[in-house]
Interface confidence: low
């Protein structure tokens, strides 16, 4: 049976979803176990002009020290104002000084990056040491690069489309996810559904997605259900500021009791099917419906609280 619920974008003041993911449009992770220099390459596209970027390098300490030097090659297409955090890491940075400016002096060795196309930048980087990771990111707001984490099976890093960077790289896109909403026809009452659909990633290892839900209404005002649907290898850690009904695939636990895993359900994996599920749970409003790439952290802020739905 077709569920009549015309999903339309909701305004950011009614609902906003941000997320952190390891999925990249192009990327690779390789192993370079004996290299004295760990090389990472980031190609960053900023489609709407000048941007701010937070870039954090994190070292996984081996025997209490960080043994290798790191070369980070930063290729950007437009002006970027960079907040770099790389405490205690012997970092060399190659970048275009006319496009990248720092929030504070970087305190690292820097090299001017030649104006080469991508393939030549990779070759230039590879001449300095084996490339451990490379990624192409579109409009990042923040990036976390974990050093010494490379678990790739490749011995040589070659950019490939639609890659999962695993623990090596996580990033947050600047643009929030598209949030849509609708009224479920023929359902009375004020119960609202928040539906989050996480799409399969390019790596099928077990994953925990942390879902932070912040609804700005008084606890007594809310009658809501949170529907989380994802591939079979995804489990959920829920951090919510309100009590609500939970309906998920896989297993889920709450941040306040992380050791207590609760078994989920088999849910439909289509938007129509999930809307049907919301209707079956007596929701009259789908306050937010979001489809995301496989993410590690998802934050939903909404202020609908069973009130009238406002679409943009």
């Amino acid at each position: 049976e077709t569920v009549h619920c015309d999903l339309q974008p909701v305004g950011p003041e009614r609902g906003e979803v941000t997320y952190t993911t390891s999925q990249v449009s192009k990327g690779c992770v390789a192993q370079a176990p004996n290299a004295i220099l760990e090389v990472h390459v980031l190609f960053l596209e900023f489609p709407t002009g000048p941007s701010q970027l937070e870039l954090t390098l994190q070292a996984s300490k081996q025997n209490g020290t960080w043994p290798r030097e790191v070369l980070l090659v930063l290729s950007v297409n437009s002006s970027v104002f960079l907040h770099l955090q790389a405490l205690g890491i012997p970092l060399h940075l190659a970048y275009n000084s006319s496009l990248v400016t720092f929030q504070e002096p970087p305190g690292v060795n820097t090299t001017e990056l030649p104006s080469f196309p991508k393939t030549q930048i990779l070759e230039w980087a590879a001449e300095r040491g084996p490339i451990t990771s490379a990624a192409e990111l579109n409009d990042p707001q923040s990036i976390l690069l974990r050093l010494g984490q490379a678990q790739g099976s490749l011995s040589f890093c070659m950019l490939e489309a639609s890659q999962d960077m695993g623990r090596t790289l996580e990033w947050r896109p600047r643009t929030p996810a598209l949030v849509r909403g609708c009224h479920l026809e023929g359902v009375a009452g004020h119960k609202e559904a928040h539906i989050l659909r996480v799409l399969p990633g390019h790596s099928a290892g077990p994953r925990t997605v942390t879902v932070k839900v912040e609804l700005s209404c008084a606890p007594g005002d809310l009658d809501a259900v949170l529907i989380l649907q994802g591939p079979p290898y995804v489990s959920w850690l829920i951090d919510a500021n309100h009590n609500m009904q939970i309906w998920t695939t896989g297993e889920y636990s709450f941040k306040i009791f992380p050791e207590k895993n609760i078994r989920g359900f088999k849910l439909p994996d289509t938007p129509q099917g999930l809307l049907g599920e919301a209707r079956m749970l007596n929701a009259s409003i789908v306050a937010s419906f979001v489809e995301l790439p496989l993410a590690s952290i998802v934050s939903l802020h909404a202020s609908s609280c069973g009130g009238r739905l406002q679409t943009s």
Epitope: P47, T48, G49, N77, F81, H83, T101, Q103
Partner: antibody
Framework: EVQLVESGGGLVKPGGSLRLSCAAS????????MDWVRQAPGKGLEWVGE??????????YYAESVKGRFTISRDDSKNTLYLQMNSLKTEDTAVYYC?????????WGQGTLVTVSS | DIQLTQSPSSLSASVGDRATITCRAS?????MHWYQQKPGKAPKPWIY???NLASGVPSRFSGSGSGTDYTLTISSLQPEDFATYYC?????????FGGGTKVEIK
């Protein structure tokens, strides 16, 4: 609700100076990249310049046509943006809009008219 | 500097007509933004990042394009759509606007 209110416009002689203000409310001003855009009578929009957020060290950028003559500043404690205009020319006559850049100009003030004439 | 050329510079049409405004960049840009302005009023954000409607913009408006050619389309003109539309880029410094397209009632 985001609000931007410009003030300080008026009539000034060529070579003179004027300071425009823009009072902001309804958002975290200190985190915002703020711009001035102007529009000469009956003409199109022209970007004047920008001042970035505290996190961006309040970096400023200007259009070539005003570089060296105009200065953009801000007082985050007062939620106010300023445009100091020196050595004014007749071609600077325009309505000056204060606007917020968030991937595009998502909020605009109502504008204040500056007339440079002898 | 990237020059943005809007065409036509003015367009006369009737309520219910389909209207198309184009914006051509002198070199490739990643995204184009569009603003609507009515006489004596400040511009309003209308379409951002080439194809996304700003808050409150009716669905009869759409945006498309890539590279150097971008389009704003109104599927069925309504009385409130008669205004001037400006395109804008900031893929490359400095930020530039198009010269504007005035949509007038025939």
């Amino acid at each position: 609700e985001v609000q931007l209110v410009e003030s300080g416009g008026g009539l000034v002689k060529p070579g003179g100076s004027l300071r425009l203000s823009c009072a902001a409310s309804g958002f975290t001003f200190s985190d915002a990249w703020m711009d001035w855009v102007r529009q000469a009578p009956g003409k199109g929009l022209e970007w004047v310049g920008e001042i970035r957020s505290r996190a961006s060290n309040h970096a400023t950028y200007y259009a070539e046509s005003v570089k060296g003559r105009f200065t953009i500043s801000r007082d985050d404690s007062k939620n106010t943006l300023y445009l100091q205009m020196n050595s004014l020319k007749t071609e600077d006559t325009a309505v000056y809009y204060c606007t917020r850049w968030r991937r595009f100009f998502d909020s605009w003030g109502q504008g204040t008219l500056v007339t440079v004439s002898s | 500097d990237i020059q943005l050329t809007q065409s036509p510079s003015s367009l006369s049409a009737s309520v219910g007509d389909r209207a198309t405004i184009t914006c051509r960049a002198s070199s490739s840009v990643s995204y184009m933004h569009w603003y609507q302005q009515k006489p004596g009023k400040a511009p309003k954000p209308w379409i951002y990042a080439s194809s996304n409607l700003a808050s409150g913009v009716p669905s009869r408006f759409s945006g498309s394009g890539s590279g150097t050619d971008y389009t704003l389309t109104i599927s069925s003109l309504q009385p409130e759509d008669f205004a001037t539309y400006y395109c804008q880029q900031w893929s490359s410094n400095p930020l530039t606007f198009g010269g504007g397209t005035k949509v007038e009632i025939k």
